[in-house]
């Protein structure tokens, strides 16, 4: 099917600045410094193509990319297929942002990314350092006290935890849009799930201890865990896919060029043996140090500390597929009863994890929906 | 529940060869990660040689060109090659798997080698 794809779609060789101005759009880009040195590009289009006349505050949205991706998740099908512009072009102010390690998020004041330290990190200081620095950013600039945030994947995740363990923050948060939201990952079918009982030193012996590739631990399951649906091997070779899962029902082949050449943006080593502790634990808590001893020295406490989403009471809308491997519908319907502030649920049966950024009919399933809800918000 | 067991360790001279097996009692086939350690006296145990169910292989910088971690599927049993060897692979070396079910470890083997 996609054995022999021959790009196509210019915005395979550009960066977000550009894919935003290649369809019309005003871009400003900028770039945040987090409490620990992290350089993140943050991108903002201010308004749409139609309203940059509209005077007065715009809402502010803020997008958060998931596992193993950026920013360009929102910008990647075309204009009305793509969360970024849709709520441009409804009047709002739209901020993407990117997690540390990805392709915009590679740069650090204090370590190289050639060195193991700078890839010391996992979804806890995305939640504990990026989240912060962004909205903090956001906030100064656009004169606004509150935010919506939309996420995506493990921008839910960092959402959960930075929303419930920084009150201050959290009162930012007008409304959380949680897309194919993950917590705990006890129910995955993901392939990480083949990699919880590996032992931390054989992980990082395999793996290495910095940027993550997905090497070739991952080849002995495709024949028949991932490519025998129709597919080919180009999707077979990309992380991103591997681990999220894929099907080709509901996608625009056409864009998979710009797909493939923007994912996966990368992450670290560090962040994808926290996935697995999380599979093989069943919870939803703080990296694993892996002896008390190392564990006390950042947590004061032999083991980690559990997320309580409880806390959050941030006002939440979800939305999850039926047939998501990496968020399943059983590990979603543990969390939805734990958020205190849930106002609304839509479970779309034959949606899997990667539908929420890219389905052809994610407006008519997902994004019309945040759109008109915004707009409620604003009356 | 697979029980791992290793033989061929023992005295060597520096240059040497020896093979190590690993006997498993279930099928080997269904690991995805078949692996060697080694505990040099007075360390922790870390891999040497790692070994994928697509058959890719990863070795330790300090015996790679030296060590071959192989694997019989119909034998049930790992095999760790080891030439040219020095004293500084003295140690405890260990078989180990990982699966669906868990990780699993042998109970070691001694290998010295002397000057």
């Known amino acids: 099917l996609f054995g022999k794809l021959h790009p196509g779609s210019p915005e395979v060789t550009m960066n977000i600045s550009q894919m935003i101005t290649y369809w019309g759009y005003p871009n400003e880009e900028y770039e945040v410094v987090t409490e620990d040195g992290y350089i993140l590009e943050v991108n903002r289009i201010p308004y749409g193509k139609k309203n940059s006349g509209n005077t007065g505050q715009r809402p502010v949205v803020f997008l958060q990319h998931g596992l193993l991706a950026s920013a360009t998740n929102w910008i990647s099908n075309l204009p009305n297929n793509s969360l970024a512009f849709i709520l441009a072009d409804a009047g709002y102010d739209v901020w993407l942002g990117n997690s540390r390690g990805n392709t915009w998020a590679r740069r650090n004041l204090y370590y190289s990314p050639d060195s193991v330290e700078f890839w010391a990190f996992s979804f806890d200081e995305m939640a504990k350092y990026d989240l912060p620095a962004t909205i903090d950013f956001i906030v100064k600039k656009t004169g606004q006290k509150q935010l919506h945030y939309v996420g995506h994947s493990q921008g839910t995740t960092i959402g959960f935890i930075a929303f419930s363990t920084n009150p201050s923050l959290a009162k930012r948060i007008k409304t959380f849009y949680a897309l194919a939201p993950v917590a705990t990952v006890k129910y995955t079918k993901s392939l990480i799930n083949k990699l919880r009982f590996v032992p931390q030193s054989l992980f990082k012996f395999i793996f290495g201890d910095k940027i993550f590739y997905p090497h070739n631990f991952f080849d002995q399951f495709l024949a028949t865990e991932v490519c025998s649906r129709e597919m080919l091997n180009l999707l077979c070779s990309n992380a991103l896919f591997i681990i999220c899962g894929f099907d080709s029902k509901n996608f625009n082949t056409s864009r998979l060029d710009v797909y493939l050449s923007h994912n996966p943006a990368g992450t670290s080593v560090q962040n994808m043996f926290h996935w697995t502790q999380a599979v093989k634990s069943g919870k939803f808590q703080a990296y694993d140090w892996g002896s008390p001893v190392q564990n006390r020295m950042h947590y004061d406490q032999s083991q980690p500390p559990y997320y309580n989403v409880t806390a959050m009471n941030v006002p939440i809308a979800v939305w999850n597929g039926g047939k998501d491997l990496l968020a399943d519908p059983q590990d979603v319907g543990l969390l939805l009863p734990k958020l205190p502030n849930l106002i609304y649920h839509k479970e779309i049966p034959f949606y899997n994890h990667l539908d929420f950024i890219w389905a052809m009919d994610a407006p008519q399933e997902v994004y019309n929906d945040i759109v008109s809800m915004i707009s409620e918000d604003k009356k | 529940q697979v029980q791992l067991q290793e033989s061929g360790g023992g005295l060597v001279q520096t240059g040497g060869s020896l093979r190590l097996s690993c006997a498993a009692s279930?099928?080997?086939?269904?690991?995805?990660?078949l692996s060697w350690y080694r505990q040099a006296p007075g360390k922790q145990r870390e891999p040497v040689a790692a070994?994928?169910?697509?058959?890719?292989?990863t070795y330790a910088d300090s015996v790679k060109g030296r060590f071959t971690i192989s694997r019989d599927n119909i034998k049930n049993t790992m095999y760790l090659q080891m030439n040219s060897l020095t004293p500084e692979d003295t140690g405890v070396y260990y078989c180990?798997?990982?699966?669906?079910?868990?990780?699993?470890w042998g109970q070691g083997t001694q290998v010295t080698v002397s000057s």
């Open positions: 070994l994928m169910g697509s058959g890719s292989t």
């Open positions: 180990a798997g990982t699966g669906a079910e868990g990780h699993y």
């Open positions: 279930g099928s080997i086939g269904s690991m995805y990660v």
